[in-house]
Interface confidence: medium
């Protein structure tokens, strides 16, 4: 027999045994040109010394063979003795080591067995009712096909599936969709209705992401707010990469997970645009506002679960950058302006109500005034910051107000709204004695002290009602007490307190009157008492002796009065309390002891004021002696 013909003789080996796991398989035969044909197959097992024979039986029952040696591919023409217009049965017998192995048979009509192409070009992938739908253009002149797919995950081997018959210019296949792992798919085709015809090669891999994109595991950090009012958002941890099947590990498109950053600026709700989406690679600068940042993972099927973080507002405040002037027409704020044509967002919120939405106002684009300041004014009628409470004010700026990532913080500060002058007036002013010539003035903290940076200082005013001399004493905003010293005994004073802000003088508190009565020192009281006692004692002793002598001469003795109550003292808890000297003084001199006397004008609210007390039971001594301060001396404060 010739090498190009099918030899109609018995093959040169014993009968085939197809029971072996190894041997020839996947035989496919097809027309490759108008008169040319090709059969090819796979051989499983050791190939050394293997001879292959392609067997063919015609419909008449006659059989022949082609000897191909070690080759697993054979081309022949329609003149090779094999009927191409009628059905034939083909199989491969492989002879090796005195043993013959046989492939499964293929029955087909060679002329009609066109070599089918796999799906080519762009395979569109979509999701349909929880399944994967693949669609592609049918290769030219190959309408009518049977289609198979195979798929694998990173941890599984290939699984075969059937797409069913196709008979259109576009072909499609429904495949299983995995929820959480990526898959690799390949497709192949063969002529419809010819079971024995060969399959095409497998298509290029189609890489399919999981139905749910992975949860983005990322971490952010925010830098400190810079002097320019911006802070950088930085990514501390990149998202973890998806595990991919073998054929998808190169630059295969389709399984990519893209991560996007969605910024939501919570502050300044009156601005035009509150959210912006940008790629994770393009980390933005932020103002000092509060933001919600979401990382959204998406794949070809759309967005998946997102992870949201809250970036709190920067709490750093500038107590002096904002100037506020309150006039009859309303209130105006001034602050250092930004560049030309800048839009400002002024936001205010009562302190303690941070959870609620802030109020804000967007200015028209403005240029700096000649002093380099920007301004915002509002009337009393508008009700803005009208309540007498502490407000947190933040001013943001942008040359492009519609661009969320281009806002910056100009300043953040506090302001006391309403009639701050009156509302801030200190209450519960009280005066207590402190020493022989000084008093302690106390008051309840001003409402302004609840507003960080607003209360600049307290001022305590002391007026000598005799000379009408007035002195004012500044007190730190954190203090609520001052000591007024160098006071004169017997003089009436009035004291008032006010709370000042940087831009506003407060209103004085109700005047409190007090005076210091001149008192004798403890030593004087002691010696005076002792002298009186000794004098009485002496007089008593002398009188007693004298009377005794006289009585003895004038009156006879009387019996002892046992039951008489005539000379009993009334029962009671009357105590005599001596004011003891604090220290022994060599020179027992007259000292001024202070008694503070408070008095109020009629109709004025009486505050709880403590009178400087002497020890209980000690007599109050008012001396006629007027002890005066030297001329020019006033109240002096000790803080």
């Amino acid at each position: 027999c010739g090498t190009s013909e099918c030899c109609f003789q018995d093959p040169p080996y014993s009968d085939a045994d197809s029971g072996s796991a190894s041997g020839p398989r996947d035989l496919s035969c097809y027309r490759i040109s108008s008169a040319g044909y090709e059969c090819s197959w796979q051989y499983e097992g050791p190939t050394a010394g293997v001879s292959h024979f392609l067997r063919c039986c015609l419909s008449s029952g006659r059989c022949c063979y082609f000897a191909t040696g070690s080759a697993t591919r054979l081309q022949f023409s329609d003149q090779a003795g094999v009927s191409v217009l009628h059905t034939v049965t083909l199989w491969v017998e492989s002879w090796a080591r005195n043993r013959t192995e046989k492939s499964p048979e293929v029955t087909l009509q060679l002329y009609k067995s066109v070599k089918y192409k796999p799906p080519l070009g762009d395979i569109k992938v979509s999701k349909l009712a929880g399944q994967l739908r693949m669609e592609w253009e049918t290769p030219d002149n190959q309408v009518g096909a049977e289609v198979q797919f195979r798929h694998r995950t990173p941890s599984s081997s290939w699984k075969l599936g059937d797409c069913g018959p196709q008979d259109d210019d576009t072909e499609s296949c429904l495949c299983p969709l995995e929820m959480n792992v990526a898959q690799e798919f390949q497709l192949r085709r063969r002529r419809l209705g010819s079971q024995g015809s060969s399959w095409s090669k497998w298509s290029s891999p189609v890489c399919v992401p999981p139905e749910n994109p992975p949860q983005p595991q990322v971490r952010f950090s925010v830098e400190q707010l810079g002097r320019d009012g911006r802070r950088r958002l930085t990514l501390k941890e990149q998202p973890t990469q998806l595990e991919l099947p073998e054929g998808c590990q190169g630059p295969a498109p389709g399984v990519e997970v893209t991560y996007q950053l969605q910024l939501h600026m919570l502050s300044c709700p009156c601005k035009a645009k509150a959210t912006r989406t940008l790629p994770l690679e393009k980390m933005p600068y932020l103002s000092g506002a509060a933001y919600n940042v979401a990382v959204i993972s998406s794949n070809r099927f759309g967005p998946g679960p997102n992870q949201t973080w809250h970036i709190p507002a920067d709490t750093h405040t500038e107590p002096v950058a904002l100037n506020i002037s309150v006039g009859t027409n309303g209130t105006t704020m001034y602050w250092p302006a930004r560049a030309q044509s800048t839009t400002y967002c002024i936001e205010w919120q009562p302190v303690g109500q941070e959870g609620s939405l802030a109020t804000c106002n967007l200015t028209a684009p403005q240029d700096p005034d000649p002093a380099g300041m920007a301004t915002y004014s509002w009337s009393r009628e508008s009700g803005a910051m009208g309540q007498e409470k502490c407000y947190h004010i933040t001013i943001f700026a942008s040359a492009h107000p519609k661009k969320l990532t281009l806002w910056s913080t100009v300043l953040s500060t506090y302001h006391f709204g309403g009639n701050a002058s009156a509302a801030g007036t200190p209450h519960h002013v009280s005066v207590k004695n402190h020493s022989l010539d000084s008093v302690s003035v106390d008051w309840a903290p001003s409402l302004l002290s609840t507003c960080p940076g607003v209360l600049k200082e307290y001022v305590v005013r002391c007026r000598d009602e005799d000379s009408n001399q007035v002195s004012e004493h500044p007190v730190q905003p954190t203090e609520t007490q001052v000591t007024l010293s160098d006071l004169r005994a017997g003089v009436a004073y009035t004291v008032q307190v006010r709370a000042d802000t940087a831009w506003l003088r407060g209103a004085w508190s109700q005047p409190q009157r007090f005076s210091i009565k001149v008192q004798v020192s403890d030593w004087f009281i002691f010696f005076a008492s002792l002298g009186s006692f000794l004098s009485i004692l002496l007089v008593g002793v002398l009188g007693y002796l004298g009377l005794n002598r006289a009585t003895r001469h004038l009156c006879p003795p009387l019996p002892t009065p046992c039951a008489s109550s005539a000379i009993q003292f009334p029962a009671g808890k009357e105590t005599w309390q001596w004011i003891n000297p604090v220290d022994f003084q060599e020179e027992a001199s007259l000292q001024e002891a202070l008694v503070v006397e408070m008095s109020w004008d009629k109709g004025e609210r009486t505050e709880l004021l403590e009178k400087a007390e002497l020890p209980e039971g000690a007599p109050e001594l008012a001396l006629d002696t007027q002890l005066s301060l030297e001329d020019g001396d006033r109240c002096k404060a000790k803080m």
């Epitope: 320019d228 393009k282 600068y285 492009h400 990532t405 281009l406």
Partner: antibody, heavy 121, light 107 residues
């Protein structure tokens, strides 16, 4: 008014270096991101590099990464492009362009007139 | 890098015509797209930013639309000074990329 004036272009041999400058005036230079964009003769525009307002962030096109360096001197209101290991394909008109705000983002609202760089042996 | 594809590459039109130029991105770029006009020997000029916002000083006959991957620049009534080359540019992600340009010529 905003003005951007490029300088430093010229003819240079392949492998050599060149430094371009861009003098800015008429706006607060420290508040704006800046970029270099080039245009080869008869071709389209190609973004080369960008720098944020403070100079802390720089970005480059893949074609120049590792060879070109963008920098700025805010005290002199000047943008620079240091070009090393020049190639024939770097021949182009180089434009200095301003971003509308402090980051290299949102397109370019002002452009210089350009300076021609010719890389030829 | 994101590829920006403009179409057509060139077009001929008459004064008063409505002209539409499209730009397609190889991946979604939200609305981060700008359009420029460039005349021979001149620097480009910004017309549209954020896909549809008109740059100040640009005539209202220019308008932009689109989001994601497909964008359009429209000149509602072409004027003699509008004959130029138009470029789109994405600033969604670095490196920023331009389209190849569309030349608008007089018919």
């Amino acid at each position: 008014q905003v003005q951007l004036v490029e300088s430093g272009g010229g003819v240079v041999q392949p492998g050599r270096s060149l430094r371009l400058s861009c003098a800015a005036s008429g706006f607060t230079f420290t508040s704006y991101g800046m970029s270099w964009v080039r245009q080869a003769p008869g071709k389209g525009l190609e973004w080369v590099a960008g720098i944020s307002y403070s100079g802390s962030d720089t970005e480059y096109a893949d074609s120049v990464k590792g060879r070109f360096t963008i920098s700025r001197d805010n005290s002199k209101n000047t943008l620079y492009l240091q070009m090393n290991s020049l190639r024939a394909e770097d021949t182009a008109v180089y434009y200095c362009a301003r971003s509308p705000d402090y980051i290299i983002d949102y397109g370019f609202d002002y452009w210089g007139r350009g300076t021609l760089v010719t890389v030829s042996s | 890098a994101i590829q920006m594809t403009q179409s057509p590459s060139s077009l001929s039109a008459s004064v008063g015509d409505r002209v539409t130029i499209t730009c397609r991105a190889s991946q979604g770029i939200s609305s981060d797209l700008a359009w420029y006009q460039q005349k021979p020997g001149k620097a480009p000029k910004l017309l549209i930013y954020d896909a549809s916002s008109l740059q100040s000083g640009v005539p209202s006959r220019f308008s932009g639309s689109g989001s994601g991957t497909d964008f359009t620049l429209t000149i509602s009534s072409l004027q003699p000074e509008d004959f130029a080359t138009y470029y789109c540019q994405q600033y969604w992600i670095y490196p920023f990329t331009f389209g190849q340009g569309t030349k608008v010529e007089i018919k």
